[in-house]
Every structure is written in structure tokens, then in C-alpha cells.
């Protein structure tokens, strides 16, 4: 017997049923995706990283997800302390607030 | 679209220093990370660096580690490569490229002689 | 620092054939790895990422495969364009690192 047609990657199991005149079958399948890939295609990568190059975790899609604390594309940028200036104060740390010079304070402000 | 304009050739004596510069357009500059490669002439590719354009941090491979410098200018989109004591084998063609899953885009190379 | 084997060096083929060339690291670099096609006097251009996605743009005839420390670019059928340097790259770790290329010729 054979099958031809789409699968998609999934976690579950497929049911195939076939009749062929002499015989029924009745098949289960499943077609996952490498580690670390996910999508249809399993054309996407993600694999949690915690360094210079991001902060993230990967979501059932295989999308990134930030660390707390951490923001952008690639989660690589750090969210200040709320509060903090940001014309005065940056960080480069989760929950940090470094002032420019001349300013001081909590938030730079 | 994405783009990735080098300043142009450079003629250095030895022992001297060069500053190249990589400006970018069609995308958000501090969004990725700017790398540097060179190639000498009719030999391989070579990664130099990285710079965290948001930030500034570099992390360099440690080949170059004494004689690099990485920087970014936020107000142009600019990022620049200055590589120090420069000596005959430096005589290559140094690429900025961007990306982090491989790099989709490419500066148009500098090329750096370095001859007495 | 990973040490990026590639292989072959170069290589004589003729427009039609399948050709594999293969690039070996010296550690576990899991999925981070990148092919690219070099032209004489051009940037490099990004064929596949993440050892077996291809990018954007790139025809169907190029495909990777591989994980962990052995990994592979396949050309199903050489077109004339294809004739050209590939390099394999690892992004895993400080310093990525290069294979020394495979120069792919017409016999």
C-alpha cells in the first residue's frame, strides 16, 4: 500500500485508511520536524540561546521569545528599570539604569 | 531594501592604521548586529568580529583581538572596522555583512594593500 | 576555536551532475551552519542557513543536510551558474569560522 499526498509535521498521529479491493488497511502516521525546526516546512529554526547573541526561548511555532528582560528581534536589548530616562539613562542589563554624564538619580531624570 | 555601502580602496604603509566604514540603509540600523570578514587575495574567508549595534559591544576573534576596533555611529547607520599595525598580510578585501542565522547581506568589499 | 574541515578542495564536474561537498567541525555545533556561493570578485551569497534551510531566492537544486558535527550541500542537477567557490560557516560559538572553500569547476 502506499499513500501519496501532504503531511504536515504534527504531534499527532494520522489516521490513513485504504481500500484497494482486495484488502483494507488502516495506517497511523506522523512526520515531525528535526530538532529545533518547526513550520510545514520545517523551514524555521529556533534554539533557546542565553548570550551575546540573544535571550530567548522558543514557542510551539518556533517563534522566539524573549527572555524577562529582554526585547528585540534577536532579544538581545535589555529593558531598563521602568522609569528610566531614555534621553538620560540607558542599560545594558535587565532592570538597570545607567545615567549619561550629568545626570543622576533613580531613572536618570 | 537592505543595504550595505563600504568606503572605497585604501593604499596603507605598513605599521599604519586603517578605518573602513559600512553604512546601511532599508532597515532599522540597531535592530542587527554588523560583522566584519576579509578575504586576502585568492585565499579563503575570515570572520574579524561582531558589533551589537544597539550597544556598541564587540566581541572579536581573537586573531585580531590587539589590533581591531569595532564602532557604530547610531545617527548615520554607519558602522566602522579600524584595524591597527598593519602589515603586508592584511592586504585583503574586508567585507561588512549583517545578519545572525547566516549573512543574507553583504557590504560591496574594501580593498586594503598594505605595501611599503 | 572549531575547526571547520571542508571538503573537496576543489572539484571538476560537468553541467547535469549531482555534487556533494561536505564540511566536518570539530565540535557539536548543532544546526549553525551556513553555505555560501562566491563568484570571483563578488560578495559571497547565502545559499542555505541553519545547516538545512534555504534562502531566500536560492533554486530548489541546492539543498543541505546535516547536524551536529558532519554536514553536506547537494547540487541536484549543475547549472552553468553554478560554477564557483562554496564555503561552509559556523555561527555556533566566538569566533565563526570558515571552511577553506571547495572551487567548483568544468571539466
Known amino acids: 500500500a502506499s499513500h501519496s499526498g501532504m503531511i504536515n509535521p504534527s504531534r499527532q498521529w494520522q489516521t490513513l485508511k485504504q481500500n484497494t479491493g482486495v484488502a483494507h488497511f488502516e495506517y497511523q502516521i506522523r512526520v515531525t520536524c528535526d530538532d529545533y525546526y518547526y513550520g510545514f516546512g520545517c523551514n524555521k529554526f529556533c534554539r533557546p540561546r542565553d548570550d551575546f547573541f540573544g535571550h530567548y526561548a522558543c514557542d510551539q511555532n518556533g517563534n522566539k521569545t524573549c527572555m524577562e528582560g529582554w526585547m528585540g528581534p534577536e532579544c538581545n536589548r535589555a529593558i531598563c528599570r521602568q522609569g528610566c530616562s531614555p534621553k538620560h539613562g540607558s542599560c545594558k542589563l535587565p532592570g538597570d539604569c545607567r545615567c549619561q554624564y550629568g545626570w543622576q538619580g533613580l531613572y536618570c531624570d | 531594501q537592505v543595504q550595505l555601502v563600504q568606503s572605497g580602496a585604501e593604499l596603507k604603509k605598513p605599521g599604519a592604521s586603517v578605518k573602513v566604514s559600512c553604512k546601511v540603509s532599508?532597515?532599522?540600523?540597531?535592530?542587527?548586529?554588523i560583522h566584519w570578514i576579509r578575504q586576502a587575495p585568492g585565499q579563503g574567508l575570515e570572520w574579524m568580529g561582531i558589533i551589537n549595534t544597539y550597544y556598541g559591544d564587540s566581541k572579536y576573534n581573537q586573531k585580531f583581538k590587539d589590533r581591531v576596533t569595532m564602532t557604530v555611529d547610531k545617527s548615520t547607520s554607519t558602522a566602522y572596522m579600524e584595524l591597527s599595525s598593519l602589515r603586508s598580510e592584511d592586504t585583503a578585501v574586508y567585507y561588512c555583512?549583517?545578519?545572525?542565522?547566516?549573512?543574507?547581506?553583504w557590504g560591496q568589499g574594501t580593498l586594503v594593500t598594505v605595501s611599503s | 576555536d572549531i575547526q571547520m574541515t571542508q571538503s573537496p578542495s576543489s572539484l571538476s564536474a560537468s553541467v547535469g551532475d549531482r555534487v556533494t561537498i561536505t564540511c566536518r567541525t570539530s565540535?557539536?555545533?548543532?544546526?549553525?551552519l551556513t553555505w555560501y556561493q562566491q563568484k570571483p570578485g563578488k560578495a559571497p551569497k547565502l545559499l542555505v542557513y541553519n545547516a538545512k534551510i534555504l534562502a531566500a531566492g536560492v533554486p530548489s537544486r541546492f539543498s543541505g543536510s546535516g547536524s551536529g558535527t558532519d554536514f553536506t550541500l547537494t547540487i541536484s542537477s549543475l547549472q552553468p551558474e553554478d560554477f564557483a567557490t562554496y564555503y561552509c560557516q559556523h555561527h555556533y560559538d566566538i569566533p565563526w569560522t570558515f571552511g577553506g572553500g571547495t572551487k567548483l569547476e568544468i571539466k
Open positions: 532599508g532597515y532599522a540600523f540597531t535592530d542587527y548586529a
Open positions: 565540535e557539536n555545533i548543532y544546526s549553525y
Open positions: 555583512a549583517r545578519g545572525y542565522d547566516g549573512f543574507a547581506y
